[in-house]
Amino acid sequence: QRFAQAQQQLPLESLGWDVAELQLNHTGPQQDPRLYWQGGPALGRSFLHGPELDKGQLRIHRDGIYMVHIQVTLAICSSTTASRHHPTTLAVGICSPASRSISLLRLSFHQGCTIASQRLTPLARGDTLCTNLTGTLLPSRNTDETFFGVQWVRP
Amino acid sequence: QRFAQAQQQLPLESLGWDVAELQLNHTGPQQDPRLYWQGGPALGRSFLHGPELDKGQLRIHRDGIYMVHIQVTLAICSSTTASRHHPTTLAVGICSPASRSISLLRLSFHQGCTIASQRLTPLARGDTLCTNLTGTLLPSRNTDETFFGVQWVRP
Amino acid sequence: QRFAQAQQQLPLESLGWDVAELQLNHTGPQQDPRLYWQGGPALGRSFLHGPELDKGQLRIHRDGIYMVHIQVTLAICSSTTASRHHPTTLAVGICSPASRSISLLRLSFHQGCTIASQRLTPLARGDTLCTNLTGTLLPSRNTDETFFGVQWVRP
């Protein structure tokens, strides 16, 4: 009983429960394929507990293995639209620091209008994750269609 | 050593490890787009540890941030079937209490026969999750093709 | 404070944080539909903390409920390729011990070139997971396109 109480009194941060779920804010300017994210209770059901946003990109605050997940849906899209505008590709990667730059997750839309995936990956404090959408189609900003998140899993 | 033993003796519920994985039971009557779920060891590999089923819908018992995941495959489906019967859409949302009603996750099948996705979302005790399949195609009842689950991640 | 320190000094294994993320090594010989996996820091961002590889297949070392996830992308693939070579199917299951053999997760590619999904499932120490890719198309070996992992969630 005392242990359970003690555990509840611990700051969650000391348990390493870093977690974030983001919604799309906007796409980048002309030559910038990055998606820009936003999060926080004022925006709906998105949140950041530990990680932070740096100019719309997600920055990690705690070393560890993370589950990274994403769903992106293309706006006003049909299978005809998707195949006509192929290739449209989504890549999630570490974009800074430059020394750690790597693609973590990559998917093409082909004849579909939504991609969704997830993976486990080691991330370090200071890693910034970027989500690059290449192609000529816009992502939906509906919060139930396009979202991006991370969950700390273990050291 | 003593700490590890103490931890194992704690009820899991006090650690907040609520988790459920459900299999499809049946679809709803004519005007009801909801899928009805079932779970428990007698049924195979589905289970409920914390959350409960209320008339085939999943009810949350512990406040927190949850990972919600789902896969739905359409029955006797080909890409031709899927595109012919488009739009077929799956939405996961909070359907009660009505004051908290919101769509959490939405996907269309387009020319595919399976959708699968996952997201992090805050849920509160008493929230009931509904999964609405709109369209004229049946979901597969095979337990490796259609399933729905939640996992408590943090308070 | 003392509790937090004590917790950090515990071996992670006693907390049950078994986790693995694997990358594709190679496909099987002629009549063997299994994918053969590899993992470890020398290979990039793949790792095994708890589970082990047994001839390229993932073996579980701790009883519990696991989140199993996978993404497989077909090599040099377009929607035309995928539909022309249909059916191409990916199944994840317990392949040994034989007494516990079962399919956990199954997806067809239809007109798409990537499948990605995840599910919660109980696994026992000694369970070996196999991933069977049936069809005549090769999986991509790019580490951001094809990967397979498990995460221990609770006892």
């Epitope: - | 499809l24 004519q30 495959t73 359409l74 029955a75 006797i76 489906c77 031709t80 595109s83 012919r84 019967h85 488009h86 004229t136 195609l137 049946l138 597969s140 009842r141 095979n142 337990t143 093709e145 259609t146 | -």
Partner: antibody
Framework: QVQLKQSGPGPVQPSQSLSITCTVS????????IHWVRQSPGKGLEWLGV???????DYNVALMSRLNITKDNSKSQVFFKMNSLQTDDTAIYYC?????????????WGQGTLVSVSA | DIVLTQSPASLAVSLGQRATISCRAS??????????LHWYQQKPGQPPKLLIY???NLESGVPARFSGSGSGTDFTLNIHPVEEEDAATYYC?????????FGAGTKLELK
């Protein structure tokens, strides 16, 4: 309530063609497919073909070369045409549909059109 | 094409007794966790009336004395207790793939 009403001929000469219209009410042809089934003493119940919600068709391979199914969504009408009729095409022809799911089982049927092929 | 074989071709049952009709498919009509086998009742001068769909689901308005069972290739329609209005011809039908096919029918008469 959902209804399927058939119009069409009685007697048809051998080698002539058959045309039947199925007019539906209380549902949209843009949501459900309409199937055609015939029944004869010799062959029993036989599925002939379907026109799906998107206008695409599937036919019984044995009759494919002789069948044509089209529709006019705005008029809620489906048109069944069969060429080169022979005496063994004598049957009652039905249009039919499912209730909620667009698979081939049929809670709803038209009243049937009796077609007799004879010289 | 999948061939459906019904037996018996005809049967006579007393009021209140059980009628059992069998339908065997030349290959499995099961897929995706369902068996795509359905049962109809037909009376002279009327189109077939759907009784049971997907092996065991009672169509709305159909009395509970009708029930269906089976899986894979072997299916059964049971009527119990048989009532006077049940005298008719009964057909099984599959929709596992195209073309859907029907059984030749079983004629139920009352003793």
């Amino acid at each position: 309530q959902v209804q399927l009403k058939q119009s069409g001929p009685g007697p048809v000469q051998p080698s002539q063609s058959l045309s039947i219209t199925c007019t539906v009410s209380d549902f949209s042809l843009t949501i459900f497919g309409i199937h055609w089934v015939r029944q004869s003493p010799g062959k029993g119940l036989e599925w002939l073909g379907v026109i799906w919600r998107d206008g695409s068709t599937d036919y019984n391979v044995a009759l494919m070369s002789r069948l044509n199914i089209t529709k006019d969504n705005s008029k809620s009408q489906v048109f069944f045409k069969m060429n080169s009729l022979q005496t063994d095409d004598t049957a009652i022809y039905y249009c039919a549909k499912n209730r909620r799911y667009d698979y081939a089982w049929f809670p709803y049927w038209g009243q049937g059109t009796l077609v007799s092929v004879s010289a | 094409d999948i061939v459906l074989t019904q037996s018996p071709a005809s049967l006579a049952v007393s009021l209140g007794q059980r009628a059992t009709i069998s339908c065997r498919a030349s290959k499995s009509v099961s897929a995706s966790g369902y068996s795509f086998l359905h049962w109809y009742q037909q009376k002279p001068g009327q189109p077939p009336k759907l009784l049971i769909y997907l092996t065991s689901n009672l169509e709305s308005g159909v009395p509970a004395r009708f029930s269906g069972s089976g899986s894979g290739t072997d299916f059964t329609l049971n009527i119990h207790p048989v009532e006077e209005e049940d005298a008719a011809t009964y057909y099984c039908q599959h929709s596992r793939d195209f073309p859907p096919t029907f059984g030749a029918g079983t004629k139920l008469e009352l003793k």
